[in-house]
């Protein structure tokens, strides 16, 4: 004997995030007479997704109209879909009763599936900074993505790493997909202008995949190299001593010169100079008084850079070499911001 | 008052694809309101209902040719289509067009004068 | 498929006569019936919808009864234009399917 079929055509419908997916159903009867109902899921727990008799299901628009008394298509429309509405969906025949309504066959169901694009990749580095010839880690994580098949590169200034480790997760079934990958990166000197990149390949993304970056000027930190070195003879007894401060990153940097290991000034780098591979030089100097002082004079210059400690270099300042001048122990005119006298 | 008019060619070759056009004029087809459908009458026999198809594209074919049957609309021309593949012999028949009433009058209620289609080498 | 069984297949009958033509469905169909009219070289036409509704604009002379798997479509004084074969088709079930039909003639 012939009966009702509820027929759902199509076994799985793949949709992108955002748009619309239509889930098809045909009765091949209008007996018994009764009203069409769409679920998510089956048994006890299934949601209820649309019904023709009763409700508000402002998602849900109808392919047909179902008011026609010789309407068989009770196919839907869901909008604006989202990885959450990923299940699978049965249309179910209803049986007109009394007082209830009576299940009377269902469709063998329809699995949605979301397509959804991976949110831009936020990579991030080490929460301190590196000093060249170490190897630094570099964390990249994209989320909300389906299907879960996906493709992750790292580079660094275009050339492709090979030292990183990718999870992907959940490991299950999920309706949508996060993305967690660590590089490791060796800097060198070279690296304040250089950049680590991570690209993200997706069925989502036809061919143009989404990339994070990170500078590595705010990973890398190039300790500066130092270098006293004594001026000739400004006038008879003045001596201008420079302590040259060279290749280094970032800029913040403080310099302190000692005299025979005392304090003589402090002062903080301003008008540097900047190299092609992004480092600073810069340069302080000291005008010293040399008839001020019976014995030889140390001099310090003292580094401090980007909160690290101190690095030093010192230089020896002969006084022998220099007549002494009676009454000359009065201070000499300064004659530069970066000039002072050693009484 | 909506008019039915089935075009194309009277003949075809056996394993070829009959293709069929139907015109409707006087009333829109994506209206929503009527099923749009293909009937047959092989010479001298009765009616053998095809299919229909629904403005929204909904289609539903007879399974005893569900598998070389195909019904398209293209309501930009106000236009329904069949599509019968490897035709034999037992293909031969006078094809109508004819629109179905989804409210009021159910039936069918407006049809094309048919087209004899030959399926011959 | 819903098979319809017509019959008779062909009956003659003078003008003035009451005709019957009966429609057997192989299950219920409810009302779900329609009846044609289809003359020689001639499209189909409605006559009669869900098993007993006339059509806009066809003669009186022409009804329909029956529910459930037994059908009757009367003509109660039989025109010599009323000469045709006569289908019932039901839409209860897809596919929609046709009965035999039956020859209508003037004797």
């Known amino acids: 004997e012939e009966e009702l079929q509820v027929i759902q055509p199509d076994k799985s419908v793949l949709v992108a995030a955002g748009e619309t997916a239509t889930l098809r159903c045909t009765a091949t009867s209008l007996i018994p007479v009764g009203p069409i109902q769409w679920f998510r899921g089956a048994g006890p727990g299934r949601e209820l997704i649309y019904n023709q008799k009763e409700g508000h299901f402002p998602r849900v628009t109808t392919v047909s109209d179902l008011t026609k008394r010789n309407n068989m298509d009770f196919s839907i429309r869901i909008g604006n879909i989202t990885p959450a509405d990923a299940g699978t969906y049965y249309c179910v025949k209803f049986r007109k009763g009394s007082p209830d309504d009576v299940e009377f066959k269902s469709g063998a169901g329809t699995e949605l599936s979301v397509r959804a694009k991976p949110s831009a990749p936020v990579v991030s580095g080490p929460a301190a900074r590196a000093t060249p010839q170490h190897t630094v880690s570099f964390t990249c994580e994209s989320h909300g993505f389906s299907p879960r098949d996906i493709t992750l590169k790292w580079f660094k200034n275009g050339n492709e790493l090979s030292d990183f480790q990718t999870n992907v997760d959940p490991v299950g079934e999920s309706v949508s997909y996060s993305i967690h990958s660590t590089a490791k990166v060796v800097l060198t000197r070279e690296d304040v202008h250089s950049q680590v990149i991570c690209e993200v390949a997706h069925v989502t993304l036809q061919g143009d995949p989404l990339r994070g970056t990170a500078n590595l000027s705010e990973t890398i930190r190039v300790p500066p190299t130092l270098e006293v070195t004594q001026q000739p003879v400004r006038a008879e007894n003045q001596v201008n001593v420079t302590c040259q401060v060279r290749k280094f990153y970032p800029q913040r940097l403080q310099l302190t010169w000692l005299e025979n290991g005392n304090v003589s000034r402090t002062e903080t780098a301003s008008t540097v100079t900047e190299n092609k591979d992004g480092t600073y030089n810069w340069m302080s100097w000291l005008l010293v008084n040399v008839s001020a002082h019976r014995d030889d004079v140390k001099l310090t210059c003292q580094v401090e850079h980007d909160g690290q400690p101190a690095v030093s270099k010192s230089h020896d300042l002969k006084v022998s070499a220099h007549p002494k001048e009676q009454g000359s122990n009065t201070a000499a005119e300064n004659t530069g911001s970066n000039e002072r006298n050693i009484y | 008052q909506v008019q039915l008019q089935e075009s194309g060619p009277g003949l075809v070759k056996p394993s070829q694809t009959l293709s069929l056009t139907c015109t409707v004029s006087g009333g829109s087809i994506s209206s929503g309101e009527y099923y749009w459908e293909w009937i047959r009458q092989h010479p001298g026999k009765g009616l053998e209902w095809i299919g229909y198809i629904y403005s929204s594209g909904f289609t539903y074919y007879n399974p005893s040719l569900k598998s070389r049957v195909t019904i398209s609309v293209d309501t930009s021309k106000n236009q329904f289509s069949l599509k019968l593949s490897s035709v034999t012999a037992a293909d031969t028949a006078v094809y109508y067009c004819a629109r179905e009433g989804l409210d009021g009058s159910y039936g069918s209620s407006a049809w094309g004068q048919g087209t004899l289609v030959t399926v011959s080498s | 498929d819903i098979q319809l069984t017509q019959s008779p297949s062909s009956l003659s009958a003078s003008v003035g006569d009451r005709v019957t033509i009966t429609c057997q469905a192989s299950?219920?169909?409810?009302?779900?019936l329609n009846w044609y009219q289809q003359k020689p070289g001639k499209a189909p036409k409605l006559l009669i919808y869900d098993a007993s509704n006339l059509e806009t604009g066809v003669p009186s002379r022409f009804s329909g009864s029956g529910s459930g798997t037994d059908f009757t479509f009367t003509i109660s004084s039989l025109q010599p234009e009323d000469i045709a074969t006569y289908y019932c088709?039901?839409?209860?079930?897809?596919?929609?399917?046709f009965g035999g039909g039956t020859k209508v003639e003037i004797k």
């Open positions: 088709q039901q839409f209860a079930y897809l596919p929609y399917t």
């Open positions: 299950q219920d169909i409810s009302n779900y």
